[in-house]
């Protein structure tokens, strides 16, 4: 990563590509993910992005990219983030002090609309997505499933 | 090295279409989404669209829709954008461009085309 | 869409001179700005993102500030290559859209 702090942040509320929320619940101890239809009115829960430069030439990287990348981590609470768990293909909250793993790190593609994605740092190819209500890890094969709606997001303000 | 060269100047008839070519070289073509920006002359700079050269997939600015088709051939590492049903107030610079971040949009343009002249007049 | 508005339209500055260009857009882009200066039958060339980040090659006299919906380029001292039109850029949305423009001249 290019530099320690980010170059901004940014809270917003996530939702899935067919506007279902993402969201937080305490539940013994730990933190839970889920992916469900809120009631009108109902508040959503906000996450602090993180946005970082990441500038490496492809011989170094083995992703094939050349140049700047953005890598975004994501805090829905003070010292959680989000983590990808590639064992387990699954997305978890831990907590954890800077500096953070790689695995809570994930580059962001927003080349499809407003939409966008979030590819793990630590396994190029495979995406935050929804899967049963719940996010998981998805391996993502052919360009074209770039576009498939289970690994889309939206970031909102409100 | 790293650029991107398109076609040369076009003079069309009201009416006509153009399509401008855009050949990109020197990085990871499918890495990076393309836009186009036109430029009327004295005038400012207006965003047309991009394409996603990954999986194709494109965004256009409203007010070219139904006109505009960004298409892509990743053998070539080539972009193209046609307008069509062009009228004289389509005459401008038409730059191919692209982003300074692979993947993403949000840290500006950094790599542009040279540009192409299209003139439409009767 | 969002709408970026520039101001001034024109400004007239010697050598030297501290010149400051502010973009406002219409709803708020976080950080997600881009400057470029375009000079005569020349493509743009970006100088600053992420609203104060300066781009690789760009000297250190260019600056930028703001986050949100009200934005500053700074030119701290300016100098004869300077002379150009300055644009902003939100880049936070499709469809991205440009301020109308600066018109840096010799006074």
């Known amino acids: 990563i290019t530099g320690i702090s980010p170059i901004t942040e940014y809270l917003a509320s996530l939702s899935t590509y067919n506007d279902q929320s993402i969201t937080f619940a305490l539940e013994d101890e730990s933190y839970e993910i889920y992916v469900e239809d809120l009631k009108k009115d109902e508040k959503k829960d906000k996450v602090l992005l993180s946005y970082y430069e990441s500038q490496h030439p492809s011989n170094e990287s083995g992703d094939g990219v050349d140049g700047k990348m953005l890598m975004v981590t994501l805090s829905p609470t003070k010292d959680f983030w989000l983590h990808a768990n590639n064992k387990e293909h699954s997305v978890e909250l831990h907590k954890c002090e800077k500096p953070l793993p790689d695995q809570a790190f994930f580059v962001l593609h927003n080349m499809h609309s407003n939409c966008v994605s979030f590819e793990c740092k630590t396994d190029p190819g495979v995406f935050i997505g929804v899967k049963d209500n719940h996010l998981a890890l998805i391996k993502v094969d052919s360009s074209e499933n770039l576009c498939t709606e289970n690994i889309l997001f939206k970031l909102s303000e409100t | 090295q790293v650029q991107l060269v398109q076609s040369g100047a076009e003079v069309k008839k009201p009416g006509a279409s153009v399509k401008v070519s855009c050949k990109a070289s020197g990085y990871t073509f499918i890495s990076y989404g393309m836009h186009w920006v036109r430029q009327a002359p004295g005038q400012g700079l207006e965003w047309m669209g991009e394409i996603n050269p990954h999986g194709g997939s494109t965004s256009y600015a409203q007010k070219f829709k139904g006109r505009v088709t960004m298409t892509r051939d990743t053998s070539t590492s080539t972009v193209y954008m046609e307008l069509s049903s062009l009228r004289s107030e389509d005459t401008a610079v038409y730059y191919c461009?692209?982003?300074?971040?692979?993947?993403?949009?949000?840290?500006?343009?950094?790599?542009w085309g040279r540009g192409t002249l299209v003139t439409v007049s009767s | 869409d969002i709408q970026m508005t520039q101001s001034p339209s024109s400004v007239s500055a010697s050598v030297g001179d501290r010149v400051t260009i502010t973009c406002r857009a219409s709803q708020g882009i976080s950080s997600w700005l881009a400057w470029y200066q375009q000079k005569p039958g020349k493509a743009p060339k970006l100088l600053i993102y992420?609203?104060?980040r300066l781009q690789s090659g760009v000297p250190s006299r260019f600056s930028g500030s703001g986050s949100g919906t009200d934005f500053t380029l700074t030119i701290s001292s300016l100098q004869p290559e300077d002379f150009a039109t300055y644009y902003c850029q939100q880049a936070n949305v499709f469809p991205l859209t440009f301020g109308g423009g600066t018109k840096v001249e010799i006074k």
């Open positions: 992420a609203a104060s």
């Open positions: 461009a692209r982003p300074s971040a692979a993947y993403s949009h949000y840290l500006g343009i950094d790599l």
